[in-house]
């Protein structure tokens, strides 16, 4: 008789994700020289550990400490890259700019980067089929504590002044209820970080609006405010010559604004 | 089994741009790290570069920067290094090399070799 | 970068002999060396990683050994397919390199 397995609204775990995992920290590591002491047997077992034999709506932080541990990694606090809805453009940033940080930039970020896991509880069975969804199943899910817990350590690691980039293409170009409004944006330590800068992307052509001024920005800028943090926002009107200029700087055409 | 087959070799002009594929298979392409190495005739082994083929991100040897550009292509496994503004000394042959995860960061795996060369 | 000096530059042998190479750093390297054979237009062969670690397949008369600047390799008792190019390689720290090569020859 086939067991009956709780059916969740989202996607099931990554296939190959214990392969995935363990492949992608032994690259980071390769990559990384300054990282080689890193076990990556033991970031799996840990990883594994966090969710494993648990029920999938019941996740806390708690459960990932093992794994924040074997991670803790030092980047320069000044050097921090946020982003919001635009992943692809700050990864493609900082891979020019590299001495700049995104959380994927991090082991465990890059560790977990674009997939899904969730186990079962009370079974060492990991859940290929479904996994629960952050809105129609619940929020304690292995994947949002898994970002909640290194968005918020991230954040709090931050110093001086911390760049965000933002998606100006999207009706709310910051939205309280992302990782970034929801999550790093408290936890930016105000003795600690000077000025948050934003970047707004735009996404047409001939988009010349200064999105510095919408409400949700006005927003962000008042929520930053009063957290005793300077708040400044640039409009990066051209995506492509933005990445242009940051690798020939010193391009003719990267002096007029981009 | 753990192959790296590389395209065949090249005769370039110099100023010209050479392309060599790196196709591999008998392992998961996006799980490891690829990178070339140059050997110019009778002389030693120089890294160039390396690119992580899950997400194209990329690191090169300074000797080569701003002429090199590898990338690589997940639906064909196969791994790409493209070689500008070829001159003289660029004539060599060109390997593509991979770890096993299990050899510390030694090139366990490498491709046969491609020759280039750059002659007017 | 770090600089890899390897001695010999050449070096002649009999079969049954016992040879060493070794190779130099200019920094500290810790364990992080490898030693690769190469014969005419094949690729090279891992042959020893993490400075004395044997690679699959190579056999036992090859070995490594040191760490931090200085590395040997060292063939016990030299078979005739063992006359060949050797290198050492840093994968300590990017760029990673390579020593110019010891070329093994028969006396």
């Known amino acids: 008789v086939p067991r009956w397995r709780q059916q969740w609204s989202g996607p099931g775990t990554t296939k190959r994700f214990p392969e995935t995992v363990l492949a992608r920290c032994v690259k980071y590591t390769e990559i990384h020289p300054e990282m080689r002491h890193v076990d990556c047997q033991s970031v799996w077992d840990a990883f594994k550990g966090a969710f494993i034999s648990k029920h999938p709506c019941n996740i806390t932080e708690e459960d990932y400490q093992p794994l924040m541990k074997l991670g803790t990694q030092t980047v320069p606090c000044n050097k921090i890259l946020l982003w919001s809805r635009i992943k692809d453009l700050a990864h493609q940033f900082t891979q020019v700019q590299r001495d700049m940080f995104t959380l994927e930039d991090t082991l465990l970020g890059y560790l977990a980067d674009d997939l899904t896991w969730c186990g079962e509880f009370n079974t060492s069975k990991i859940n290929y089929q479904s996994c629960p969804d952050w809105r129609k199943d619940c929020s304690n899910n292995p994947v949002s504590v898994f970002w909640k817990t290194v968005s918020r350590r991230f954040a709090e690691a931050a110093c001086d002044v911390v760049h965000v980039m933002l998606n100006g293409s999207r009706s709310k170009i910051f939205d309280k209820n992302s990782t970034f409004g929801s999550v790093e944006v408290h936890n930016l330590q105000p003795e600690k970080v000077q000025t948050l800068e934003a970047w707004v992307i735009h996404g047409g052509r001939e988009d010349s609006r200064d999105l510095c001024q919408d409400p949700t920005i006005k927003e962000l800028e008042s929520i930053i405010s009063k957290r005793n943090i300077q708040f400044s926002c640039k409009n990066i009107y051209r995506p492509d010559k933005f990445l242009q200029c940051v690798k020939n700087p010193e391009d003719s055409s990267c002096t007029s604004e981009i | 089994e753990v192959q790296l087959v590389q395209s065949g070799a090249e005769v370039k002009k110099p100023g010209a741009t050479v392309k060599i594929s790196c196709k591999v298979s008998?392992?998961?392409?996006?799980?490891?790290?690829m990178h070339w190495v140059q050997q110019a005739p009778g002389k030693g082994l120089e890294w160039m570069g390396w690119?992580?083929?899950?997400?194209?991100?990329?690191d090169y040897a300074e000797k080569f920067q701003g002429r090199v550009t590898i990338t690589a292509d997940t639906s064909t496994d196969t791994a790409y290094m493209e070689l500008s503004s070829l001159r003289s000394e660029d004539t060599a042959v060109y390997y593509c090399?991979?770890?096993?995860?299990?050899?510390?960061?030694?090139?366990?795996?490498w491709g046969q070799g491609t020759l280039v060369t750059v002659s007017s | 970068d770090i600089q890899l000096t390897q001695s010999p530059s050449f070096l002649s042998a009999s079969v049954g002999d016992r040879v060493t190479i070794t190779c130099r750093a200019s920094?500290?390297?810790?364990?992080?060396l490898a030693w690769y054979q190469q014969k005419p237009g094949k690729a090279p062969k891992l042959l020893i990683y993490?400075?004395?670690s044997l690679a699959d397949g190579v056999p036992s008369r090859f070995s490594g050994s040191g760490s931090g600047t200085e590395f040997t390799l060292t063939i016990s008792s030299l078979q005739p397919e063992d006359f060949a190019t050797y290198y050492c390689?840093?994968?300590?720290?990017?760029?990673?390199?390579f020593g110019q090569g010891t070329k093994l020859e028969i006396k």
């Open positions: 993490d400075a004395n």
């Open positions: 690119i992580d083929p899950e997400y194209g991100r990329t």
């Open positions: 390689q840093q994968y300590n720290n990017y760029p990673y390199t």
């Open positions: 920094e500290d390297i810790y364990s992080n």
């Open positions: 090399a991979r770890s096993a995860h299990t050899t510390g960061f030694g090139f366990a795996y």
């Open positions: 008998g392992y998961t392409f996006t799980d490891y790290i």
